[in-house]
């Protein structure tokens, strides 16, 4: 229904009357409408609702509403529908995040690793290796490392110490004479490999594929996460050049990429879920920071002086 009434607070725009050449100041139309007839010396402008498939976000003096962005490509879903007041906005479904306007599944942290930061619709999950006293026995994109069962609190002893991948195994001690009784203290310590980690802050990665072969050897690379890229470690007795070589031997699917970070270059080991052929399960584009906001927000390149 065309609307002629002007609000007191509404802005104005200038319009040149084609018949007279006169510059007129007209009231803008509200968001969700457009100017179907400009004002004249004797009449107010006329506003009409944006037709289906078009929108105007703000009060305006434009003669045609903007076309909505095209439908969201699968598997994206509509975050905001195309309506008179809003453009269509697309986002990735739960369990996926947006990268270069495509959706990639959230990384699954392998056994021995837990979620450090939950994934969102714009950022991947960040994994971290389970710290001493914690473990993760299932690959997951949502679960954190869990604390070992406290055997002593249940009046039990640790029969088998936990690792990054397994919980403590609790049990009762058979009655021994005091001379042969094992010391419970020694049983509670995890394996030495589990107690020490060596960090080299410059080696960074995101899990790629993480199939059984890779995850078995992933203990040599411990993610501590920066942005959506995960930071790892290699033994500190290797030189940086040698370190790169060794990590690549251990994890053959690592890709080495250069990544500018601050004033200096950082060396990044990028680990993505296997995308052997498609390049699409994880975006094959260079790593960028997570894209924020609606990918099409700048696509209406025409700037209309009568809008806003």
């Amino acid at each position: 229904q065309p609307e002629q009434k002007a609000s007191n607070l509404i802005g104005t725009y200038r319009h040149v009357d084609r018949a007279t050449g006169q510059v007129l100041t007209c009231d803008k139309c509200p968001a969700g409408t457009y100017v179907s007839e400009h004002c004249t010396n004797t009449s107010l402008r006329v506003c009409s609702s944006c037709p289906v498939g078009t929108f105007t976000r703000h009060e305006n003096g434009i003669e045609k509403c903007h076309d909505c962005s095209q439908p969201c490509p699968w598997p994206m879903i509509e975050k905001l529908p195309c309506a008179a007041l809003t453009d269509r906005e697309c986002t990735c479904p739960p369990g996926m995040f947006q990268s270069n306007a495509t959706c990639a599944p959230h990384t699954v942290c392998p056994v021995g690793w837990g979620v450090r930061k939950k994934g969102t619709e714009t950022e991947d999950v960040r994994c971290k290796q389970c710290a001493r006293g914690t473990f993760s026995d299932v690959p997951s994109s949502v679960m954190k490392c869990k604390a070992y069962t406290d055997c002593l609190s249940q009046n039990l002893v640790v029969i088998k110490p936990g690792t990054k991948e397994t919980d403590n195994v609790c049990g009762t001690l058979p009655s021994f004479s005091s001379s042969t009784s094992p010391s419970p203290g020694t049983a509670i310590f995890p394996r030495p490999e589990h107690m020490e980690t060596h960090e080299v802050p410059s080696s960074t990665y995101v899990p790629k594929g993480m199939n059984s072969t890779e995850s078995n050897s992933s203990a040599s690379v411990r993610p501590k996460v920066l942005s959506s890229i995960q930071e790892g470690t290699v033994p500190d007795n290797t030189s940086s050049a040698r370190g790169k070589e060794d990590v690549n031997k251990t994890l053959p699917n690592l890709q080495v990429v250069n990544h500018q970070q601050g004033p200096h270059h950082r060396h990044i080991l990028k680990l993505l879920p296997s995308m052997e052929a498609t390049g699409g399960e994880k975006s094959s584009t260079p790593i960028k920071g997570p894209k924020r906001g609606h990918p099409r927000q700048n696509l209406h390149k025409h700037f209309d002086i009568n809008e806003h």
Partner: antibody
Amino acid sequence: EVQLLESGGGLVQPGGSLRLSCAASGFTFSQYMMSWVRQAPGKGLEWVSVIYPSGGSTHYADSVKGRFTISRDNSKNTLYLQMNSLRAEDTAVYYCARGHYGMDVWGQGTTVTVSS
Amino acid sequence: DIQMTQSPDSLAVSLGERATINCKSSQSVLYSSNNKNYLAWYQHKAGQPPKLLIHWASSRASGVPDRFSGSGSGTDFTLTISSLQAEDVAVYYCQQFYSLPLTFGGGTKVEIR
């Protein structure tokens, strides 16, 4: 080696049921969209169904909606297709396939024959 | 639903010659936000599962010989085999993955003349 292996096909009477399985190995199964695609004798490829990595979302072709159910068990690295109320036109080789921006890994297929 | 139409239905080409297969979608599969065409090409040999050749309309899948190339944008796409080899005898399918249901073209059978 990345592999998908289907099983569960066979001969079934119209109105009957069958459950297909697809065992995945060599990749992080829980990280991928998985689909079923079929090919009827002498016909082209037809997409049947897709399931999201977590299993939380599923979609079906109109031709099977309400009769087929796709599911997955990420702990067992296995994809399933439960087929009920089978019809003669469901006779086909059924493939499971990995991926959403192009299906990059396919199983060898399992044959389903619906006939009285 | 997006309909995919392939032409020709079959094609006989001499060894070493160029083979061209066309695919037309009933609506655009180009997403302007990332400038990607949501289209794939597959090769399907008798007795084998289909094999992904091309994704994003023009990106070759890993391990695919460079005699295979994909081109086109929007609604019109082409798969080209620059120099046909005996092992290329197969049925070729295009597939859109822009929207559900995912749809395939009817297939083009490539034979040796």
